[in-house]
Amino acid sequence: REAAPKSYAIRDSRQMVWVLSGNSLIAAPLSRSIKPVTLHLIACRDTEFSDKEKGNMVYLGIKGKDLCLFCAEIQGKPTLQLKEKNIMDLYVEKKAQKPFLFFHNKEGSTSVFQSVSYPGWFIATSTTSGQPIFLTKERGITNNTNFYLDSVE
């Protein structure tokens, strides 16, 4: 049986959701006028970079779009970007596609996503609405790195 990605809506503790703005992801308040993205999540089959203490290795994509999250260095700083890629194309690759990989770890009822390419760097939202989703190594008050994955039918 062919694997299929799981679908989730994603929120942070301040009820900010992820929204597609052009070809980038931003955080916006959960509201009726805003259409949040549905996140596609699928496990990586290759175990080359696996580290169970950090979580399960997953690819993250945007449902309904051939867009996947990946990490690259820009001016010496790890940066979160969206790349035109079908998540299933990543999944079927025998070799793990490291820039697209994240460690998915559960902390209580929340999920945390850490870059495999840049250990210690986590997907985060700012406390300010309308700001891009980004990578941070500073977990805490000013950045939200814990997310709720809400099942969507």
Epitope: A9, S31, G108, S109
Partner: antibody
Framework: ELQLQESGPGLVKPSETLSLTCTVS??????????WGWIRQPPGKGLEWIGS???????AYNPSLKSRVTISVDTSKNQFSLKLSSVTAADTAVYYC??????????????WGQGTLVTVSS | ESVLTQPPSVSGAPGQRVTISCTGS?????????VHWYQQLPGTAPKLLIY???NRPSGVPDRFSGSKSGTSASLAITGLQAEDEADYYC???????????FGGGTKLTVL
Amino acid sequence: ELQLQESGPGLVKPSETLSLTCTVSGGSITSSNAYWGWIRQPPGKGLEWIGSIDYTGSTAYNPSLKSRVTISVDTSKNQFSLKLSSVTAADTAVYYCAHGKYYETYLGFDVWGQGTLVTVSS
Amino acid sequence: ESVLTQPPSVSGAPGQRVTISCTGSSSNIGAHYDVHWYQQLPGTAPKLLIYGNDNRPSGVPDRFSGSKSGTSASLAITGLQAEDEADYYCQSYDYSLSGYVFGGGTKLTVL
């Protein structure tokens, strides 16, 4: 049709703990994307949000009451509960439980219990 | 005292139009969180009247409408009827408090 019913003592002594339960019927307390809240209304005054718990078990509390409040869920009984410690006369109010869904009511409350009056007095 | 500010009272004659304002700040209404309105008839529990700024749940007459702009929102009631006499509350979410916030309530009197 979803219905909520508050229950608990109508009289609590000062310094004691107020305990209320909200029984959910016509739906599951673990229903995907649902959140459940406690809201109170002192006699002749406005509504005050006390705290909430959602289907993941995540809780949030009003900062002004946080040190005294605990909200929990009993999935086996399809209930959620409120505990408010060290009560004073200022905690005398009608207490309501309420329901919402993240991607349907957008942080509003669409179903309310009928409310229960709790008086704090010795 | 309330995070959202409403006038304590408004009044109007039957058939008239009245509006109730709700003023918040940049951490709630101004941050683009939705505003919801509740009607509380005497001696009863609040009932959701408007959700998501301007949407009526089924069963709510179209005489009731909501709008939002900047850090404020308003509820309009047209063709005022005696049974509209009630308390009305606005509600939103505040990210700085990580919680739900209510207005102080407005008592509507039908003259």
